[in-house]
Interface confidence: low
């Protein structure tokens, strides 16, 4: 019998609102095992593979996806998802990324420190069980 | 050489279930996303949804539950669950350039007439 | 909820004209614009993408610009093969949308 996956949990590093020009990371969590973490946009076609995943606990594993230089356009719901031979897990809950226009730097107080989802309400829109973990092209920890 | 065609409108009652396809050669649809995309005679394109290539879809907001977009190994089918005469309309499929959302849709089809009329 | 507003419906200018299409989202979209065009009983052809990159095969003739809320084309030069609808679309979201498109913009050339 197959297992049920768990859902992942979303965070973004160093939190959800974010100064123009500035970094942030998104990091997807799930059970180790995991073979690809993808990070998406809601219904959006854009989304990004990794296979580099790490340990984070006996029990945990991540992945983790650097906008180095976050603009307007990258504002938006964003949310998880991986493969774990061999399924698709749910979607994690959304994540939402508010850029700020400010002066302030990367390590401005503007910034909320540890946003996150973690796996409480499904989502109600597409599932993504028939999913092949197939990248598209675009390179982990440099989302777009 | 790269290709999409639309095939499978045709005059059908309101209610009537239709499935269109769209075939393509020349290209993988497990690397790019494909769309469906309508003009009504005398009006302006209109998206309807999505096809991701690992098999995922996304609707346009009025679509959600009256379009259904499906895909096998080189087609993908777009299928009008209880058409409307509102429905009557050219159905294009269109790839989405280098299989990514931001470039556009670089690849269409030169589209298949449904018309519905009782 | 994305929208596109394009502007005009429709214009009319002469053979070595200039003719500006404007396009407006309601909200940001970065540089994620693609413009095409579609002659009468004709499927659409990509013209430009990321608000002002060239599809293959375009002559420089036509030119995208803008970024954020509002981008426009431009077709100088005005050729007859020019006659077509001009469509906008904004390639940022392709779900929680009524319509990608613009309502179009009809070119005559006089």
């Known amino acids: 019998q197959e297992e049920d996956l768990p859902r992942p949990s979303i965070s973004a590093e160093p939190g959800t609102v974010i100064p123009l020009g500035s970094h942030v990371t998104f990091v997807c969590r799930g059970p180790v095992g995991v073979q690809t973490f993808r990070l998406e946009r809601e219904s959006r076609s854009t989304y990004n593979d990794t296979e580099d995943v790490s340990q984070a606990s006996p029990s945990e594993s991540e992945a983790r996806f650097r906008i180095d230089s976050v603009s307007e356009g990258n504002a938006g719901p964003y949310r998880c998802i991986y493969y774990k031979p061999p399924k698709w897990s749910e979607q994690s809950d959304y994540l939402e990324l508010l850029v700020k226009e400010t002066s302030g730097g990367p390590d401005s107080p503007d910034t909320e420190p540890g946003s996150s989802a973690g796996p409480t309400q499904r989502p109600s829109d597409n599932s993504h069980n028939e999913h092949a973990p197939a990248s598209q092209g675009l390179k982990a920890e440099h989302l777009y | 050489e790269q290709s999409v065609e639309e095939s499978g409108g045709r005059l059908v009652t309101p209610g009537t279930p239709l499935t269109l396809t769209c075939t393509v050669s020349?290209?993988?649809?497990?690397?790019?996303?494909m769309c469906w995309v309508r003009q009504a005679p005398g009006k302006g394109l209109e998206y309807i949804g999505i096809?991701?290539?690992?098999?995922s879809t996304g609707y346009a907001n009025w679509a959600k539950g009256r379009f259904t977009v499906s895909k096998a190994s080189n087609t993908v089918d777009l299928k009008i669950s209880s058409p409307t005469t509102e429905d009557t309309a050219t159905y294009f499929c269109?790839?989405?350039?280098?299989?990514?959302?931001?470039?556009?849709?670089?690849?269409w089809g030169p589209g298949t007439l449904v018309t519905i009329s009782s | 909820e994305l929208d596109m507003t394009q502007t005009p419906a429709s214009v009319s200018e002469p053979v070595g004209g200039t003719v500006t299409i404007k396009c407006q989202a309601s909200?940001?979209?970065?540089?994620?614009l693609a413009w095409y065009q579609q002659k009468p009983g004709q499927r659409p052809k990509l013209l430009i993408y990321?608000?002002?990159t060239l599809a293959s095969g375009v002559p420089s003739r036509f030119k995208g610009s803008g970024s954020g809320t509002d981008f426009t084309l431009t077709i100088s030069d005005l050729e007859c093969a020019d006659a077509a609808s001009y469509y906008c679309?904004?390639?940022?979201?392709?779900?929680?949308?009524?319509?990608?498109f613009g309502g179009g913009t009809e070119v005559e050339i006089k």
């Open positions: 909200q940001s979209i970065g540089s994620n």
């Open positions: 020349g290209f993988s649809l497990s690397s790019f996303h």
């Open positions: 269109a790839r989405v350039n280098y299989g990514d959302w931001i470039n556009g849709m670089d690849l």
């Open positions: 679309q904004q390639a940022y979201w392709s779900g929680n949308v009524d319509n990608v």
């Open positions: 990321k608000a002002s």
């Open positions: 096809i991701y290539p690992g098999g």
